[in-house]
């Protein structure tokens, strides 16, 4: 039993972690600067998307890049519980706090703000430079989707790294996982064409959910054949003239559930991965 | 002046490097096993490409993946001159060999075989599982292209890492370079749509040359509108019914030079990067 409550411990751990973050601002400022620069570079490359076949390719390309970038940059989250492992074991054994207080304290003060910022920065810069769908809901859905991808990827990083003493193995394992997840995200291969004995792997792919949601959000209601003047029975059947046609060919469900089910899946992954990370910390103290 | 000739020294360095390679086979065997497994996985995912719109997406996707994989896996080449830096300085100062003998010896015995193998393995596995263009010249052009990409990426790694004491900085720099090169390769963004003040960056992208060559090699002469006798002059500018239409939309020159100029560019990059690496080794001994 502890003399202080869970909330008090949580506040204390959060405060200390946040102070560490502010006391050593180089890392966080560097991350923000890199994100801003990358956002501006992406914005410049894809500036002013067209509504033609190149517009389809460029939209898919930038959404894929943003999704996979969120994943790969989340690899750094492996450090969260690794670098302080000895300190955590010492303080836990000394009865300073519960595992749960430490766990949620670190998440609230470190993971939550540091994974939220890039999503906000990317969306704010990229959205208007590219001229993505000009509706407020589409803007915030994109921001929310990128956050969910970042959180699920970071949660996976924590689940793999929690309790480990060295970062390198976890980083390597994460990178390999993300490479395979990237293949199954839906840009490099049309997911409807994969053999059934392999296609189930797509359901374990974080970027697949993020990329699908971003595409659903951006492509629905778009038209990619401006001023089309073609005869009825000709090769134009093979063109992709509407966002819906593109999404259909990608095997994406066009209903509202076709969008939100991706966020539900990411939320489930976050819960599962964080539970694993928490249990690993819980078992860690038993073997200390 | 040296008592032994350049050729003798070259043979001696090559022999020793090759012995080290065979004496510690885990790394090379592991690389071969990983390549074979990855080849089979890619082969299974993309098995039997269709000749429809999904066939365009999947062909482009797999060629992009193979190209970028060759680049990113070449990052490991940074180790070639870094791990033996102290030994090289000691042996060079002791008058064992010329810088040129050491440089070319390491390239011949280490870089050449270890970068050639993945290209051969990938092509042999992937080509037939996917059912790519069924001609011998197309098969060998693909193999040659993947080799050229691997060599130019490895040369870039050497140019960055030569003379450095730690691998990590060079690896990070390489990775950042390849991420930007990957954006400019031609899948994530249609290169014809990039603003002129930025589009020149594509000419510094290794994967762009590899990906363009692979696409030229694979798409030329293909038909993607089954049940339609598609001509090059399509009646619908929004449909992509032939490989030529696809390549044209990507801004790829359809002439034979449109293929080979990519290999020439990669060859030039190899020469430039290896020259930089050699000069860095040459200047290294001056400051030893």
């Amino acid at each position: 039993s502890y003399t202080t409550s869970f909330c008090h411990q949580l506040r204390w751990v959060s405060k200390r972690s946040f102070k560490n973050l502010l006391g050593n601002p180089q890392a966080s400022i560097a991350q923000i600067i890199v994100t801003v620069i990358l956002g501006l570079v992406i914005g410049a490359i894809y500036f002013g998307l067209n509504n033609d076949s190149t517009g389809i390719q460029n939209r898919a390309g930038v959404l894929f890049f943003l999704t996979t970038n969120q994943c790969f940059s989340s690899v750094s989250a492996v450090e969260l519980f690794v670098v302080e492992k000895k300190l955590f074991i010492h303080e836990y054994i000394s009865g300073y706090y519960r595992v749960s207080s430490y766990f949620f304290g670190k998440l609230l003060s470190d993971l939550l703000p540091m994974r939220m910022l890039p999503s906000i920065i990317f969306t704010c810069i990229v959205y208007f430079m590219l001229g993505l769908k000009p509706t407020a809901d589409a803007f915030f859905i994109m921001m929310f989707t990128l956050m969910m991808v970042a959180y699920s990827a970071s949660s996976m990083a924590l689940a793999i790294a929690a309790g480990q003493s060295v970062v390198s193995v976890a980083t390597l394992l994460m990178t390999i996982c993300f490479v395979f997840m990237m293949i199954f995200s839906g840009l490099l291969v049309n997911l409807t064409t994969i053999a059934s004995w392999l296609s189930w792997l797509q359901y374990f792919s974080i970027p697949r959910y993020g990329f699908t949601a971003l595409q659903h959000n951006e492509f629905l209601g778009q038209n990619f054949c401006p001023g089309l003047n073609a005869t009825v029975n000709n090769t134009c059947n093979y063109a992709t003239c509407t966002g819906e046609e593109y999404l259909t060919k990608q095997g994406i469900d066009l209903s509202p559930w076709g969008l939100w089910k991706n966020h539900v899946a990411l939320a489930c992954m976050i819960v599962i991965f964080l539970t694993i990370a928490y249990l690993k910390l819980l078992f860690l103290k038993k073997y200390s | 002046s040296y008592t032994t000739s350049f050729c003798h020294q070259l043979r001696w360095v090559s022999k020793r490097s090759f012995k080290n390679l065979l004496g510690n086979p885990q790394a090379s065997i592991a690389q071969i096993i990983v390549t074979v497994i990855l080849g089979l996985v890619i082969g299974a995912i993309y098995f039997g490409l269709n000749n429809d719109s999904t066939g365009i997406q999947n062909r482009a996707g797999v060629l992009f993946f193979l190209t970028t994989n060759q680049c990113f896996s070449s990052v490991s080449a940074v180790e070639l001159f870094v791990v033996e830096k102290k030994l090289f300085i000691h042996e060079y100062i002791s008058g064992y060999y010329r810088v040129s003998s050491y440089f070319f010896g390491k390239l011949l015995s280490d870089l050449l075989p270890m970068r050639m193998l993945p290209s051969i393995i990938f092509t042999c596995i992937v080509y037939f599982m996917l059912g790519l263009k069924p001609t011998a010249d197309a098969f060998f052009i693909m193999m040659f292209t993947l080799m050229m990409v691997a060599y130019s990426a490895s040369s870039m790694a050497l140019a960055i890492a030569a003379g450095q004491s730690v691998v990590s900085v060079a690896t990070l720099l390489m990775t950042i370079c390849f991420v930007f090169m990957m954006i400019f390769s031609g899948l994530l963004v249609n290169l014809t749509t990039i603003a002129s003040w930025l589009s020149w960056l594509q000419y510094f992208s290794i994967p762009r040359y590899g990906f363009t060559a692979l696409q030229h090699n694979e798409f030329l002469g293909q038909n993607f509108c089954p049940g339609l006798n598609a001509t090059v002059n399509n009646t619908c500018n929004y449909a992509t019914c032939t490989g030529e239409e696809y390549l044209t939309k990507q801004g790829i020159d359809l002439s034979p030079w449109g293929l080979w100029k990519n290999h020439v560019a990669l060859a030039c990059m190899i020469v430039i990067f290896l020259t930089i690496a050699y000069l860095k080794l040459l200047f290294l001994k001056k400051y030893s």
Partner: antibody, heavy 118, light 106 residues
């Protein structure tokens, strides 16, 4: 010649199900969308849903979601529309129509009259 | 859901006269499509992409419009033109039809 041939007229009791078929010929079945539309006596055309035979992606009108089921048999180049829990207001002529992408209906079937009566 | 309102519901004209059929969308659409339906028959594509005539459609027919308002015009009515005309649009994965305009002989 492009043709969409539908199955014959049906008489069903309320609460029952009906399955209408649409046999396509004269074109590559998997390259075009199959849409289903109904027309009640003296009423406007009402879209039920579409199916893309290329990868069996389906979209339904919210009004028919849960009651209508669209399927295809690509080997037989045939589309099917099943409507369950039939009510008297489902009495209508049911049409299948081929669409070029999701752009326009360029060919229609001859229609199938479904009568729901107790 | 977008609603298409056709006006007038019935249009009574004589052969040789000019006919103007209107279709208004509740919000902006990319293109409008028109179908002709005669009694006891299935509909036929008549105009696509707002202004393109389907194969076999006489040149006296024309289509125009943009945004919310679209029009089908018949410059000089022929006896075979008397039928019901439906406008149709596609937005965010769903199709909707207008209520139809019945073109009848006066």
């Amino acid at each position: 010649e492009i043709q969409l041939v539908q199955s014959g007229a049906e008489v069903k009791k309320p609460g029952a199900s009906v399955k209408v078929s649409c046999k396509a010929s004269g074109y590559t079945f998997t390259d075009y969308y199959i849409n289903w539309v109904r027309q009640a006596p003296g009423q406007r055309l009402e879209w039920i849903g579409w199916i893309y035979p290329g990868n069996v992606n389906v979209k339904y009108n919210e009004k028919f979601k849960g009651r209508a089921t669209l399927t295809v048999d690509t080997s037989a180049s045939t589309g099917y529309m099943e409507l369950s829990s039939l009510r008297s207001e489902d009495t209508a002529v049911y049409f299948c129509a081929r669409s070029i992408g999701l752009r326009y209906f360029d060919n229609w079937g001859q229609g199938t009259l479904v009568t729901v009566s107790s | 859901e977008k609603v298409l309102t056709q006006s007038p519901a019935t249009l009574s004209l004589s052969p040789g006269e000019r006919a103007t059929l209107s279709c208004r969308a509740s919000s902006s659409v990319h293109y409008m499509y028109w179908h002709q339906q005669k009694p006891g028959q299935s509909p036929r594509l008549w105009i696509y992409y707002t202004s393109n005539l389907a194969p076999g459609v006489p040149a006296r027919f024309s289509g125009s419009g943009s945004g919310n308002d679209y029009t089908l015009t018949i410059s000089s009515l022929e006896p075979e033109d008397f039928a019901v005309y439906y406008c149709q649009q596609f937005t965010t994965s769903t199709w909707t039809f207008g209520g139809g305009t019945k073109l009848e002989i006066k």
